[in-house]
Each structure stands twice: as structure tokens, then as C-alpha cells.
């Protein structure tokens, strides 16, 4: 730690006196203190001499000596009083800036320690301090206003009693700044705007902050707009509002509008887009395929996105057939608004029944006219299978009919023994029918196919099975010839995999 000579904490001298402060350290040392006139500084290796041969009240202050190379950062200090009978105060500042709830040090240094008993802090022109002003005094440092408030932003003077009269210092302006958490809060309404050419429009940009010192402006396509500003103060916040009113919009008013606000903490901006159109519009679209396939018994939500201006005057879902004249229940239709000009309409179809396949149309109307979007819903079914024995052109033939959607594939199996279903160990022969005959294929209905297996002689201790499958599931029918005649076996249960 550096050492100061003279080795006293305080030194009191008269104006005009010679003062020499010497600091010695292990390495190079440097002085720090209030910059003031008349000082001369001499450095010589590990010592530094601060001297004046004509001390003035302005030399009053605390002088600290530090050793920059010292890792412990030790320092030594001495306080110098230059007691000038005419100048009881050495004011080190014209202005003090602090944030609310910080301590504010008003640096009027007493030039004579004897005067400490009669000091006080006043506002300029002798006005008393504001109520609840909590302050303390240090002859080395000055007056400290504790936990300063914004309202205490005033001009202050330090007062000392000298020979029975009060002697004032020059004034110090205290600026207590509100703690600003960040850039001003912003709102820009509407978030999006569409107007038909010739209509009126309004865009409102507003910013608010705890501190009045902030700027706000509205710009259109990077051009700052000259708009009168309305100011207000409520809820302990300053508000500045810019309102752009357009009586008759035209295409040049379209584009990007940005509301920008800035303060010492930074800048905030928010944008919106203004679209000017020639006439009303109504657009319907869906992210879904308009041709839907769903397994019977499952559910489906049909969604339509609507973009419209002006707003919709009417909308509904309609079932166009072909199975019944039922209409979707209103409770299953749902509308959500994404924003002012975009909406989503959903029709929920839970646990679909065969009679609910067909066309569903969403219709909407606004001043631009009617629009419709139609979905085609086909239900998927697992195959249903039946087998009969018949003679075709004199030949014994097994005839398998399979019905389902999508179109089923057919496979014949011949296996030993009598069984409801051939398993691998029993299979004697397998025939794939790549092209079964399509008996019926109507939109929204099941597809029915027929496969023929010509059998010269029915083996009586064997089973003939027709199997059909599609993407939904599979079905089968076992045919067991018996001496008294043919016998057929549908499977024990209907094979259904939804």
C-alpha cells in the first residue's frame, strides 16, 4: 500500500500556503483527486509529489494515491482543507445526475472543518427542502440526499454559518432520472388494414414510458410522416399518440407503416401492412385436398380458409348428396377468426356413417358476391366376402363376390381338411386373381368385384377359401364341399380393421 507524507488523514492550510503531498510506493504511483488549478505534479520512479506554492479554496478535496501495479489495488488518501474566510465551500460540480432511489452526492466540500456544526442544505433562493428529504453531510464529500426521488430534481445550495451569517455556495443542479426499464412500449393499430379505393382509413401509433424523454414517429415505406402528436399522462406513464386519418384512400397510401419509439435505453418498432384494393374480394381455399378418403367410423374435420374484405354477410356448410337430404348439424360447424380479414371455418364429422359420404360445400357471401368450395368425401370399407357354388357353361365354378373400398384384391386358397380359415400348414394351392370382374363402381359407394374359380371336381376332404383385402382390412369365406352338397362357411367374425 502506498504511503502519503505528511502522514495525517487531514491537512488544514491557509490560502496562499505551500502544500507538498508526497506519495511513495513499491512501484510507480499515481495521484487522483478533483482536477483543480495550481497543482504541479512531479513523478520520480516509485514516488510522486503533488505540490502548489499558492493553495486556494479550489484545492480543497480528497487526494488519493494508488499503485496501478499493485494486484491488491491498495490506496492511501489525505484530505486537504484550504480554509478561506471568504469561501467556505469548494463546489466540484454544477450538476449531479442520479437515478431514482440512488443516493445523490452534492459535492460541496467544506473548506474549514470548524464550520461543520453550522452547515445546512437549502434550495436556491433560500427555499426550504421538500418534505421527506432525507440527507446527511460529510465535510470531505458534501451533502448526500438519500434515496433521491424524481420530484427532488431541483437546484440546491450548501449553506454555512460564518460569523453569525449564512454563506451560500454556488448552486448545484440535481437531476433525478426515472429508472427506465427499456425502450418505450408501443402499439400500432390496426395490425393489418385493407380498404377499397375511396374509403376512409385510420392508423394509430402510440408509445408510452415512465419518462417523458422519448420520441415517437410513424413512417410509411421508410418516409417519416409529419403528424401532430397528442400527449397524455396517466397510470404514471407518459403517452404520445400519432393518428393518421385518411379520408379517401388511394393506391399510393398502401404499403408498410412502422411505428418507431426511442429513448436512452434504445429503440422499439412495430409494423403493419395497409392494402388498398380496387373492389371487394372473397377468396376461399383449403390446405386439405378437396378429395378426401376416410375409413368408415372414423372422424374428419373439413377446414376452409376465407380471405375477405369487406366482412362476410353470410356463410354455411351444405351436404350435396348423394345419400340423403340430411344437412350438417350447425353445432358441428365452427368459425375462428385468425385476424381481421382471414377466418377459418371447420366442419366436424365424427364417426362417419355410410350415409355421410358425398359432397360437402362451404358457401360464403360478402359485397363481392358468393363463393363456394366443395369437398368430395369417399368412405373406405374393409371387404365383405361371400362364395357360392354354381355351374357355368356346364363347369362347376366357385363364385366369390367381394365388396369394399378401395377395390379389394382377391386370392383363392385350397387347403386340406375342413376349416373356417386355411392356415399355412394346410394350404395346398393358392391362386391370385389379378383382374377380378368389377360388378359395380359408383362414386361414394363400395366397389363390388367378382372372381370365378373353375373346379373340375370338388375334393370332399378339402376347403376352398376366397380371401379379399384392401388398405382398410380383409375378409374371407370358406367353402366346404360335403357329400350331401356344398357347404359354405363365412368366418366366425367379420374381419374388420378400421
Amino acid at each position: 500500500i502506498p504511503v502519503i507524507e505528511p502522514s495525517v488523514p487531514e491537512l488544514v492550510v491557509k490560502p496562499g500556503a505551500t502544500v507538498t503531498l508526497r506519495c511513495v510506493g513499491n512501484g510507480s504511483v499515481e495521484w487522483d483527486g478533483p482536477p483543480s488549478p495550481h497543482w504541479t505534479l512531479y513523478s520520480d520512479g516509485s514516488s510522486s509529489i503533488l505540490s502548489t506554492n499558492n493553495a486556494t479554496f479550489q484545492n480543497t478535496g480528497t487526494y488519493r494515491c494508488t499503485e496501478p501495479g499493485d494486484p491488491l489495488g491498495g490506496s492511501a488518501a489525505i484530505h486537504l482543507y484550504v480554509k478561506d474566510p471568504a469561501r467556505p465551500w469548494n463546489v466540484l460540480a454544477q450538476e449531479v445526475v442520479v437515478f431514482e432511489d440512488q443516493d445523490a452526492l452534492l459535492p460541496c466540500l467544506l473548506t474549514d472543518p470548524v464550520l461543520e456544526a453550522g452547515v445546512s442544505l437549502v434550495r436556491v433562493r433560500g427555499r426550504p427542502l421538500m418534505r421527506h428529504t432525507n440527507y446527511s453531510f460529510s465535510p470531505w464529500h458534501g451533502f448526500t440526499i438519500h434515496r433521491a426521488k424524481f420530484i427532488q430534481s431541483q437546484d440546491y445550495q450548501c449553506s454555512a454559518l460564518m460569523g453569525g451569517r449564512k454563506v451560500m455556495s454556488i448552486s448545484i443542479r440535481l437531476k433525478v432520472q426515472k429508472v427506465i426499464p427499456g425502450p418505450p412500449a408501443l402499439t400500432l393499430v390496426p395490425a393489418e388494414l385493407v380498404r377499397i379505393r375511396g374509403e376512409a382509413a385510420q392508423i394509430v401509433c402510440s408509445a408510452s414510458s415512465v419518462d417523458v424523454n422519448f420520441d415517437v414517429f410513424l413512417q410509411h415505406n421508410n418516409t417519416k410522416l409529419a403528424i401532430p402528436q397528442q400527449s397524455d399522462f396517466h397510470n404514471n406513464r407518459y403517452q404520445k399518440v400519432l393518428t393518421l386519418n385518411l379520408d379517401q384512400v388511394d393506391f399510393q397510401h398502401a404499403g408498410n407503416y412502422s411505428c418507431v419509439a426511442s429513448n436512452v435505453q434504445g429503440k422499439h418498432s412495430t409494423s403493419m401492412f395497409f392494402r388498398v384494393v380496387e373492389s371487394a374480394y372473397l377468396n376461399l381455399s383449403s390446405e386439405q385436398n378437396l378429395i378426401q378418403e376416410v375409413t368408415v367410423g372414423e372422424g374428419l374435420n373439413l377446414k376452409v380458409m376465407v380471405e375477405a374484405y369487406p366482412g362476410l354477410q353470410g356463410f354455411n356448410w351444405t351436404y350435396l348428396g348423394p345419400f340423403s337430404d340430411h344437412q350438417p348439424e350447425p353445432k358441428l360447424a365452427n368459425a375462428t377468426t385468425k385476424d381481421t380479414y382471414r377466418h377459418t371455418f371447420t366442419l366436424s364429422l365424427p364417426r362417419l356413417k355410410p350415409s355421410e359420404a358425398g359432397r360437402y360445400s362451404f358457401l360464403a357471401r360478402n359485397p363481392g358476391g358468393w363463393r363456394a368450395l366443395t369437398f368430395e368425401l369417399t368412405l373406405r370399407y374393409p371387404p365383405e366376402v361371400s362364395v357360392i357354388w354354381t355351374f357355368i357353361n356346364g363347369s362347376g365354378t366357385l363364385l366369390c363376390a367381394a365388396s369394399g373400398y378401395p377395390q379389394p384384391n382377391v386370392t383363392w386358397l385350397q387347403c386340406s381338411g375342413h376349416t373356417d380359415r386355411c392356415d399355412e400348414a394346410q394350404v395346398l394351392q393358392v391362386w391370385d386373381d389379378p383382374y377380378p370382374e368389377v360388378l359395380s363402381q359408383e362414386p361414394f359407394h363400395k366397389v363390388t368385384v367378382q372372381s370365378l374359380l373353375t373346379v373340375e371336381t370338388l375334393e370332399h376332404n378339402q376347403t376352398y377359401e376366397c380371401r379379399a383385402h384392401n388398405s382398410v382390412g380383409s375378409g374371407s369365406w370358406a367353402f366346404i364341399p360335403i357329400s350331401a352338397g356344398a357347404h359354405t362357411h363365412p368366418p366366425d367374425e367379420f374381419l374388420f380393421t378400421p
Partner: antibody, heavy 117, light 110 residues
């Protein structure tokens, strides 16, 4: 070794406020006096003012009405704000530590601020 | 208009001695100490002389300062090409209650 670094926008529009920050590294900002000095292109140096770590400030009388300085000891930074700027405020702005005799050492490398619309 | 007056330019050949003057008044140089700064092209000023005649560590002893009355001067002996720079004098001014600078002298090494 104490080092200083100025930062802030290089372009300010007339009538707006110039804002600069000086970051002190390699040492503490506490217990020292910190100054701002400017130098218009091809001209001499002008002292703008100083701030102490307690928030006390002293300004050049010719600029006093437009200058505000502040200090943030937690960030080891001090700042300058110069309001209602004109083209005459176009200069390189330096921050520096002010010693007990009024000498400046060290200095930041300077930042050019242009006032133009 | 600067408070302290310096010649706008000075020149010398390598090895020569050059002196730069700085003139003030009783409120600045007359009653306070003088500091000198060197500003190399494109860089920030650097403290060259403080308290009239003291050199910070690292400054060659070719640079010296002096003060007499309301004037001060900076002398550079054994001039070198790297000394080509602008030189500014500065002093505390009692009426301003702050530091003032000279207008600067551009030194050219021929």
C-alpha cells in the same frame, strides 16, 4: 493498463440528440474523473465536460445548456448526450481520464460523429 | 478561436531542435500548470508533458517543456521522422473553471 473505448451512432440528424458511451477496461471507473473532448475535422481540441463516479458533473460553459453526462459504475461506463445538434457539432469525440492537474491520460481512440440530414 | 495561441505550423530537419510556443493569459498559463499532447496522424492525442516539464514514463527525454509567465514552450531535440504530428498545449483556466487547449501546431519533419 486502463483502456477506453467510445461507442455510439456515427450519424445524427440536426436537432436530434447525440449519444455516446465510453467503456473503461483494465481498471475500475471508481474514484476517477472522466472527461469528453471533441475535435472538429482539421481543428483543435475542445473540452466538453467531466463526470465523477458519484454522478457529479462540470461542463464547458459554452455547451452547458445542451450537455448531459451520466455514469454507470456497474458497467464501467460513462456517457455523453448533446442535444439539439447542428452541423457545427460534427467532430471526432474522445473520452479520457482527467488527472489531478487537469491533464488527460489515457484517451479513447475517438469516434467520428457526423450531423447531417 | 482557441483560448491558448500556438503557431499553426513548425518544421525542422532530422536531428535538428524545434521549439513550439504556447501563449495564454493570467487566468490560465499565468496561474496554472501546462500540459502538452502529441497527436500522430489518424490517432488520439497522447499526454507528452504534464505539470510544465514532467514527462510520463515512455516519453523520450528529447521532449522537454518549460513555462515563463503567461507563455509555455515545447522543445524537441534530435528531431526524428516519427515526431511528425500535431502538438497541442493545454492549461487550466480559472475563469472557465476547466481545461483549455491551444489551436495546435502541425510539425513537419523535412
Amino acid at each position: 493498463q486502463v483502456q477506453l473505448q467510445e461507442s455510439g451512432p456515427g450519424l445524427v440528424k440536426p436537432s436530434e440528440t447525440l449519444s455516446l458511451t465510453c467503456t473503461v477496461s483494465g481498471g475500475s471507473i471508481s474514484s476517477y474523473y472522466w472527461s469528453w473532448i471533441r475535435q472538429p475535422a482539421g481543428k483543435g481540441l475542445e473540452w466538453i465536460g467531466r463526470i465523477y463516479t458519484s454522478g457529479s458533473t462540470k461542463y464547458n460553459p459554452s455547451l452547458k445548456s445542451r450537455v448531459t453526462m451520466s455514469v454507470d459504475t456497474s458497467k464501467n461506463q460513462f456517457s455523453l448526450k448533446l442535444s439539439s445538434v447542428t452541423a457545427a457539432d460534427t467532430a471526432v469525440y474522445y473520452c479520457a481520464r482527467e488527472g489531478v492537474t487537469g491533464g488527460f491520460d489515457p484517451w479513447g481512440q475517438g469516434t467520428l460523429v457526423t450531423v447531417s440530414s | 478561436q482557441s483560448v491558448l495561441t500556438q503557431p499553426p505550423s513548425a518544421s525542422g530537419t532530422p536531428g535538428q531542435r524545434v521549439t513550439i510556443s504556447c501563449s495564454g493569459s493570467s487566468s490560465n498559463i499565468g496561474s496554472n500548470t501546462v500540459n502538452w499532447y502529441q497527436q500522430l496522424p489518424g490517432t488520439a492525442p497522447k499526454l507528452l508533458i504534464y505539470s510544465n516539464n514532467q514527462r510520463p514514463s515512455g516519453v523520450p527525454d528529447r521532449f522537454s517543456g518549460s513555462k515563463s509567465g503567461t507563455s509555455a514552450s515545447l522543445a524537441i531535440s534530435g528531431l526524428q521522422s516519427e515526431d511528425e504530428a500535431d502538438y497541442y498545449c493545454a492549461a487550466w483556466d480559472d475563469s472557465l473553471n476547466g481545461p483549455v487547449f491551444g489551436g495546435g501546431t502541425k510539425l513537419t519533419v523535412l
